[in-house]
């Protein structure tokens, strides 16, 4: 998952309390026993922000040695720093671990920017704000990287919540959640509430600022808002979905879906914007330029490289327009939407100007590897990840940042057809496709 | 070629309002590829941005001057103009108008530049 | 704020030499810089943006380098036309208000 532009996290957030809540509805879905409720111990469990990834605490080994585990939905290795790097607070410590088994095998995993490598083996890992189990999973000591982890971060490692057939060096070795689900009662799914600032932090702020929700095995109410919609993962890989059509402001951009998918369309909590496919990303640029035509902002600003500051508190999003993904229902013919606000697409930056300004990047950025639909759509929703029943649901977040006027939504259903279509087939190869 | 040119009054009294305006020649100030923006410079001194101003009539401006600076633009004048109100002698300085191209982020075209006074 | 600082505040150099001058800035600003000339009782005339791209019409004497936070305006051979104040200016955080302090290039 293209860690040039995937992760990368510099501060922690503001979760649940942050900008305005919407209330919550009453219309619940039937329960579903041992699926659905109060997980009151893993809410809130998550600190970080999308411009460097959430993480949750993990322990790994006996004693138990706590570190800090960027939640990474794009990828499917556990693998944490086992060694000193000027950026680690801490690291792993194999030898102070009795219950550490060698595995005898090396894993190298390169990215577009940047790689790590290390040394496999197993070890007992839990969660203290997850579910009261410990496993053995596998564990990738990673004793050499390179643009990997990130200064001021508070991360360790990685959790990659994908599947076996992404994981390095290859789908033989089981990923973290597998082991999970195999060796306990916790059902096979998980759910994420990832809660964007909607403004700057600063550091003090960060640190004592919390991030969302990792509901592992379960759903619950209090994270969303409205009914959960689903689409299909299409194949169990990455958590790969198909998107049918796109709209700026209610405008359709009018493109064959598969250029939507071209090569692939996922759900990636690791990577901080929202990736198009450079056709897409060009339309869907000049739409929003289009939209938002009465003010002019620089080249650069488009490529999200530079920061447009307004006055704080003056940013005016009204200027900018919704975006609005609709995705492949599990009913024939049928399609749901999910439409994020500039709130979410315009991401806030701390520390560059001054008190009296709110500065901004644009977080919508071009890919040549599918569409990304990365932390600035999932910060808009609950989203859940029901591996049992091979399905995606997406629901308006408890805690998305919005304004008086607009808010983020999941609405349907819609008549779409031939959305099988939508789908682009990857040529096989003989070689990995995934040099990411 | 395009060419910009500040006028106003070089002598202003205290807690008066300022005044100038640039007029853009051998170009269309309602082009979209560029904001129009002024830029002080007081004597011996460097530069500070004071504001911009896009042919929509969208306006930014300089935060410590925030309060007291008006940019307007007039189209069919091919102009735009500068109000600094309530100006003291640390308001003396020579006013330039600019072009702001290059993806709207640098300055690539300047006028002369205009010293105005503030005096009584 | 990102501030810019520029050094040396005064180069004195002969006509021939190579004046380097440079901008730091106190937090990265990518390659979004820009250098500015202004000769005494003129205006500023851009030189370099882009930290590295040369304006239309400058010679090429006049080179910029750097990205993030330290930026270099090189003048390979200075010509008596190019004694005269050089100032930086970001534009990583837009609009674009920020001005380094300046470098006067005299003759020795």
């Known amino acids: 998952t293209q860690h040039g532009i995937r992760l990368p996290l510099r501060s922690g957030l503001g979760g649940a309390p942050l900008g305005l809540r919407l209330p919550r509805e009453t219309d619940e879905e039937p329960e579903e026993p041992g699926r659905r409720g109060s997980f009151v111990e893993m809410v809130d469990n998550l600190r970080g922000k999308s411009g460097q990834g959430y993480y949750v605490e993990m322990t790994v080994g006996s004693p138990p040695q706590t570190l800090n585990i960027l939640v990474d939905t794009g990828s499917s290795n556990f693998a944490v720093g086992a060694a000193p790097h000027p950026f680690l607070h801490r690291y792993y410590q194999r030898q102070l671990s009795s219950t550490y088994r060698d595995l005898r095998k090396g894993v190298y995993v390169p990215y577009t920017q940047g790689k790590w490598e290390g040394e496999l083996g197993t070890d007992l890992v839990s969660i203290p704000h997850g579910p009261n189990v410990t496993v053995r999973a596998n564990i990738a000591a990673i004793t050499e990287s390179d643009k990997f982890f990130i200064n001021g971060s508070n991360w360790e490692g990685i959790l990659g919540l994908a599947y076996a057939e992404i994981a390095r060096p290859d789908d033989s070795l089981e990923p973290f959640f597998d082991s999970l689900v195999k060796q306990t009662h916790v059902p096979n799914l998980f759910s994420l509430q990832l809660c964007g600032a909607g403004f700057p932090l600063n550091q003090s702020e960060v640190l004592a600022s919390v991030g969302g929700s990792m509901i592992i095995g379960g759903i619950d109410h209090s994270l969303y808002t409205g009914s959960l919609w689903y689409t299909p993962i299409r194949r169990e890989w990455y958590y790969e979905v198909i998107i049918v059509r796109v709209e700026i402001n209610g405008q359709d951009l009018k493109m064959d879906c598969k250029e939507y998918n071209y090569d692939k369309s996922i759900v990636d909590s690791g990577t901080t914007n929202l990736r198009l496919p450079k056709k897409v990303f060009e339309a869907a640029v000049k739409s929003i330029k289009a939209a938002s035509s009465t003010e002019k902002f620089p080249d650069g600003f488009w490529l999200g490289e530079q920061l447009v500051c307004w006055q704080a508190g003056t940013t005016p999003w009204n200027i900018f327009p919704v975006i609005s993904l609709y995705l492949m229902g599990e009913v024939t013919n049928q399609s749901f939407r999910i439409t994020i606000l500039p709130q979410q697409y315009l991401r806030p930056v701390e520390d560059v100007a001054t008190s009296q300004d709110d500065c901004y990047k644009f977080a919508i950025s071009q890919s040549s590897t599918g569409t990304v639909m990365g932390a600035v759509i999932m910060e808009g929703f609950y989203v859940v990840f029901d591996r049992a029943r091979k399905r995606i649901g997406f629901a308006v977040s408890a805690c998305h940042v919005h304004d008086e006027f607009r808010t983020a939504a999941v609405e349907g259903p819609f008549v779409t057809l031939d959305m099988e279509d939508c789908g682009y087939n990857i040529p096989q190869t003989d070689e990995s496709t995934l040099m990411t | 070629q395009l060419q910009l040119q500040e006028s106003g009054p070089g002598l202003v009294k205290p807690s008066e309002t300022l005044s100038l305006t640039c007029t853009v020649s051998?170009?269309?100030?309602?082009?979209?590829?560029?904001?129009w923006g002024w830029i002080r410079q007081p004597p011996g001194k460097g530069l500070e941005w004071i504001g911009m101003?896009?042919?929509?009539?969208?306006?930014w401006y300089n935060p410590s001057l925030r309060s007291r600076v008006t940019i307007s633009v007039d189209t069919s004048k091919n102009q735009f103009s500068l109000k600094l109100s309530s100006v003291t002698a640390a308001d003396t300085a020579v006013y330039y108008c600019?072009?702001?191209?290059?993806?709207?982020?640098?300055?690539?075209?300047w006028g002369r530049g205009t010293l105005v006074t503030v005096s009584s | 704020e990102i501030v810019l600082t520029q050094s040396p505040a005064t180069l004195s150099l002969s006509p021939g030499e190579r004046a380097t001058l440079s901008c730091r800035a106190s937090?990265?600003?990518?390659?979004?810089l820009a250098w500015y000339q202004q000769k005494p009782g003129q205006a500023p005339r851009l030189l370099i943006y882009d930290a590295s791209k040369r304006a239309t019409g400058i010679p090429a004497r006049f080179s910029g380098s750097g990205s993030g936070t330290d930026f270099t305006l090189t003048i390979s051979s200075l010509e008596p036309e190019d004694f005269a104040v050089y100032y930086c200016q970001q534009v990583y955080t837009w609009p674009p208000r920020t001005f380094g302090g300046g470098t006067k290039v005299e003759i020795k």
């Open positions: 937090q990265s600003v990518s390659s979004y």
């Open positions: 101003i896009y042919y929509s009539g969208s306006t």
């Open positions: 600019a072009r702001v191209g290059h993806g709207v982020s640098y300055f690539d075209l």
């Open positions: 051998g170009g269309s100030i309602s082009s979209s590829s560029y904001y």
